[in-house]
Interface confidence: low
């Protein structure tokens, strides 16, 4: 360049470059002043005369040094779903993001294109990874001992309350339901657990951890900011052991002697034997066995399978499809064996509670006056369905009941016939909604 | 006991590579998000990647995005950094930490890498 | 240059209530939880507070967090000689891929 300033246009020298905002025009074989951002050139440049730039107008934007003919125009109008985060001014162009409670599911060089509703989860599930800006949220299976009863895409699980008494047991969807004394938050052993109170959340992404309640498995569970519960179900557990029990030997004495009185009249008696069992569950079945769907037979002990379930928890927690299940946005995930689970729940509404379990066969003989030779039915009802014991994730095409609602004592003027006829097995479903195919 | 056990670290130069191994045992791994945080010597904890359950989503700190790659085999109960082109910037002590809904409650006791020539 | 910031350094006698801080934007703690770890030295960090104000079983009620707009803050009360460590703020930032950001920490003394 010469020494002086040289003013546009210019020449360039052999070889050399136009300077900065500054353009070398191939038609003038000058270096020409560039235009400002938010202005556009309206004249190129000439041998003799320099750019000549203008104002971009409304709804159109520049924003570096240019020479461009005509501004650029500004992106369409926000969507419904967006926020308009950068407004269109002369130097920029408009930047939508999405707006709270939707993200970013396809995004373009600058703000976003396309929005997405946040998922939201349904009661049973609980957020496991909030959502972000660009990523949706992620949902997963509320494990025993906690629940969500709301769909949305900021609650977690929660701890079922505790129970001195248990009017309702708890499930994955619904929180336990106590009896006149005040309740306290579970708190299972042996691990960091997190509190979970329930949440009511303003911000749209709102994590919090998600429970799991497999003992030294989770950190994040129910502790919290008031003091730990001492409360637990466990301290029930004998005495209403002890009911059960008694309950039985009464049944079954009344069964006896009506057997016996029969005998003693010269009457044949028809016994209808059914059994009633408050199971011993081996661990891979505890987590089916529990729920809403649940027949108490003996309804008197409400509580009497609420316990000792802290061991069943740990092994079927290895099995729960927390996080991993693709999902389409806006939808729920089919999360199969996992989700049946979740949707059964568990009423064990005190992780931590070792109580004894009690295992109760309750053998009722119901006989009527028949002087057909004596029948006997035996049925054992109390198999448990598992909807969370395939490795595969399908649930099983069966549907086992919980239990059978027995009709123990009938007319006598019921025939053999029409009693045995009634002895048929109807199976109850699960009450597993939605429990579809877990993805590979 | 739940725990996580990191191994790997050690000296190496500019430019060289490393894998860092973080053995998981005590819950069920395949249900969790794992990260891998670092801390350089006397300074803060960053986070470095992490990974979501099945290994099919990926995230990483800018300046080690091209260089390190997270991993894991759910079958070993295992997750891997494999940490290339090294850098000094790189020297930290490096945490395998499992991740609870964006909170990390287990935390590995950390395992050093020195790159330096 | 850590996203969240807080002060390097806090302290307190034995017995007092100290307050850490910690500082974002609306893209991270303004709309997301925010999380505290305890760093002893020469261990590894522990989860102290999680979602803004709940405690892990173990943790002391002496701790407590909160959060308001986009900043929060860790109480200390009941200051304790054990308590002399580092602090760190944790949370999501909506804006960033990886989305988890740290706080620089805050080196906290017990005088006395």
């Known amino acids: 360049l010469p020494a002086q300033v040289a003013f546009t246009p210019y020449a360039p020298e052999p070889g050399g470059t136009c300077r900065l905002r500054e353009y070398y025009d191939q038609t003038a074989q000058m270096c020409c002043s560039k235009c400002p951002p938010g202005q556009h050139a309206k004249v190129f440049c000439t041998k003799t005369s320099d750019t000549v730039c203008d104002s971009c107008e409304d709804s159109t934007y520049t924003q570096l040094w240019n020479w461009v003919p005509e501004c650029l125009s500004c992106g369409s109008r926000c969507s419904s779903d967006q926020v308009e985060t950068q407004a269109c001014t002369r130097e920029q162009n408009r930047i939508c993001t999405c707006r709270p409670g939707w993200y970013c599911a396809l995004s373009k060089q600058e703000g976003c294109r396309l929005c997405a509703q946040l998922r939201k989860c349904r009661p049973g599930f609980g957020v496991a990874r909030p959502g972000t800006e660009t990523s949706d949220v992620v949902c997963k299976p509320c494990a025993p001992g906690t629940f969500s009863n709301t769909t949305s895409s900021t609650d977690i699980c929660r701890p079922h309350q505790i129970c001195h008494v248990v009017a309702i047991p708890g499930n994955a969807s619904m929180d336990a339901v106590c009896t006149s004394t005040s309740p306290t938050r579970s708190m299972a052993p042996g691990a960091v657990h997190l509190p979970q109170p329930v949440s009511t959340r303003s911000q749209h992404t709102q994590p919090t951890p998600a429970p799991s309640t497999a003992p030294g498995t989770s950190f994040l569970l129910p502790v919290g900011p008031s003091p730990p519960a001492e409360g637990s179900t466990g301290d029930i557990v004998l005495p209403v052991g002890l009911i059960v029990g008694v309950t039985a030997l009464g049944l079954l004495i009344i069964g006896v002697v009506n057997c016996v009185i029969m005998t003693q009249v010269k009457k044949k008696p028809l016994c209808l034997q059914r059994e009633t069992k408050v199971p011993h569950l081996p661990a891979d079945k505890a987590r089916g066995a529990q729920g809403p769907e649940q027949q108490h037979l003996l309804t008197t002990v409400p509580s009497s399978s609420s316990s000792s379930l802290e061991s069943s928890a740990s092994a079927l927690d290895r099995r729960a499809p927390t996080r991993n299940q693709p999902q389409a946005p806006g939808a729920e995930k089919a999360s199969g064996a996992g989700e049946a689970r979740a949707s059964t729940g568990s009423s064990d509404s005190s992780p931590g509670g070792h109580g004894t379990q009690v295992n109760v066969t309750c053998i009722v003989n119901v006989c009527s006056s028949s002087d057909h030779s004596s029948q006997c039915s035996s049925q054992a009802s109390s198999t448990m369905g598992d909807t969370d014991a395939s490795p595969s994730g399908s649930p099983k095409d069966e549907q086992v009941p919980f239990s059978k609602e027995e009709c123990a004592f009938r007319s006598q003027l019921e025939t053999p016939e029409t009693l045995l006829g009634s002895t048929e097995e109807k199976p109850l479903p699960l009450g597993v909604p939605d429990a579809g195919m877990k993805p590979s | 006991e739940v725990q996580l056990l990191e191994s790997g670290g050690g000296l190496v130069q500019p430019g060289g590579s490393l894998r860092l191994s973080c053995a998981a045992s005590?819950?069920?791994?395949?249900?969790?998000?794992m990260s891998w945080v670092r801390q350089a010597p006397g300074k803060g904890l960053e986070w470095v990647a992490n990974?979501?359950?099945?290994?099919?989503?990926?995230y990483y700190l800018d300046s080690v995005k091209g260089r390190f790659t997270i991993s894991r085999d759910n079958s070993k109960n295992t997750l891997y950094l494999q940490m290339n082109s090294l850098r000094a910037e790189d020297t930290a002590v490096y945490y395998c930490a499992r991740e609870e809904y964006g909170a990390f409650d287990i935390w590995g006791q950390g395992t050093l890498v020195t790159v330096s020539s | 240059q850590s996203v969240l910031t807080q002060p390097p350094s806090a302290s307190g006698t034995p017995g007092q209530r100290v307050t850490i801080s910690c500082s974002g934007s609306?893209?991270?703690?303004?709309?997301?939880?925010v999380n505290w770890y305890q760093q002893l030295p020469g261990t590894a960090p522990k989860l102290l507070i999680y979602d803004n104000n709940k405690r892990p079983s173990g943790v002391p009620d002496r701790f407590s967090g909160s959060k308001s707009g986009t900043s929060a803050s860790l109480a200390i009360s009941g200051l304790r000689s054990e308590d002399e460590a580092d602090y760190y703020c944790?949370?999501?930032?909506?804006?960033?891929?990886?989305?988890?950001?740290f706080g620089g920490g805050t080196k906290l003394t017990v005088l006395g």
């Open positions: 005590g819950f069920t791994f395949s249900d969790y998000y």
């Open positions: 609306s893209s991270n703690i303004g709309s997301n939880t």
């Open positions: 990974i979501n359950t099945d290994g099919s989503e990926k």
């Open positions: 944790q949370s999501f930032d909506r804006g960033l891929s990886g989305s988890i950001v």
